[in-house]
């Protein structure tokens, strides 16, 4: 299973649920579905209030039981470490894959934290982070922001990922804007 890691704003906008949580148990494999689930302790929710409704406490995260079918395997044994988890809701259950955005909270830049807590949501409706994977690449719309981190850095941990968000400048136009200047 291979996938290009998304810009964190894309991960935020394309996910049904974005939370901060600790992984508190070893995975359990369901004898019927062959999906595995991890027990988690949610500490914050950044997106998904409406989708969840009253069931606002997520206790488990579900993923395929094998790497080759995009299953997520949690390698950290530190049960007090917090992770940012962006996933999809299926039948009221939080699902993630290898391609989901799952990262230690402490590994995120201050700008990214600001993005997840406040700013990325502003760009979800109108703006699109457009990956530029090979030259030449051009903007297909004024609401697109060209994401060149992978081209220039060979990594999703580039400057645009760590410090910028694609936000509306004016109707029909989105541009990269610094999250650092907005940090409280």
């Amino acid at each position: 299973c291979t996938c290009v890691p998304p810009h964190p704003q894309t991960a935020f906008c394309n996910s049904d649920l974005v939370i901060r949580a600790k992984f508190v148990g070893t995975p359990e494999v369901n004898q019927t579905t062959l999906y595995q689930r991890y027990e988690i302790k949610m500490t914050k929710m950044y997106k998904g209030f409406q989708a969840l409704g009253d069931a606002a406490d997520i206790r488990f995260v579900y993923t395929p039981a094998m790497e080759s079918v995009c299953g997520y395997f949690h390698r950290s044994h530190n049960r007090s470490e917090e992770f940012l988890i962006a996933g999809k809701l299926q039948d009221g259950l939080l699902h993630i894959t290898t391609c989901s955005f799952v990262a230690p909270w402490n590994s995120l830049s201050l700008a990214q934290r600001r993005g997840f807590t406040k700013t990325y949501t502003v760009g979800c409706e109108e703006c699109t982070v457009f990956p530029c994977l090979s030259i030449p690449c051009k903007l297909q719309s004024g609401t697109h922001c060209l994401w060149t981190d992978q081209l220039l850095q060979g990594s999703e941990k580039g400057f645009q990922s760590r410090h910028l968000a694609c936000l509306p400048r004016e109707p029909g136009l989105c541009t990269w804007q610094s999250l650092r200047s907005q940090i409280a």
Partner: antibody, heavy 114, light 110 residues
Amino acid sequence: QVQLVESGGGLVQPGGSLRLSCAASGFTFSSYAMSWVRQAPGKGLEWVSAISGSGGSTYYADSVKGRFTISRDNSKNTLYLQMNSLRAEDTAVYYCARGHVDYWGQGTLVTVSS
Amino acid sequence: DIALTQPASVSGSPGQSITISCTGTSSDVGGYNYVSWYQQHPGKAPKLMIYDVSNRPSGVSNRFSGSKSGNTASLTISGLQAEDEADYYCQSYDFVRFMVFGGGTKLTVL
């Protein structure tokens, strides 16, 4: 009590095909994933393939991927393993097993030889 | 391609205790609490002796016990009896290969 009965084994030439069946009884078949495990003569156990209770998810060992197909018919309480492009190294006793592999059948012998 | 490492053979006298180890990695034994142990007599199908690391199915003698530390699981048989002579296999879920077995250990009761 739980019973798993395999059938369909036999002698087949290299490159040939065979379809194994496993008839299950004594439990709610659709509530359990099922696996095929094999054991070559004088050798250890090797997991071959697994399928979820609904049949929607399937998994294969690298050694059989692209050649074997696991399936199930929940209305007949039966598990299948379609084996194509058989090789000499596929010679083994094939067992079907339930869930986390708590119950096993008695096995059926597949011999691939010219 | 054996995924879990077991000793090829162990032996003990009647009444003694023996332990069989099963070493894997953090993506199998160390990553899941799903280690099982099977007993297989010649010409017979394997029989489940221990599941979920340390649980015994009903009907299995309490002389059989299982444990796990890190990436290594262990099966202990106390008060060895002649009928315990058999091959023993460990098995675990594995994130990369889905399910893996050990190479097997031949137990001889002297």
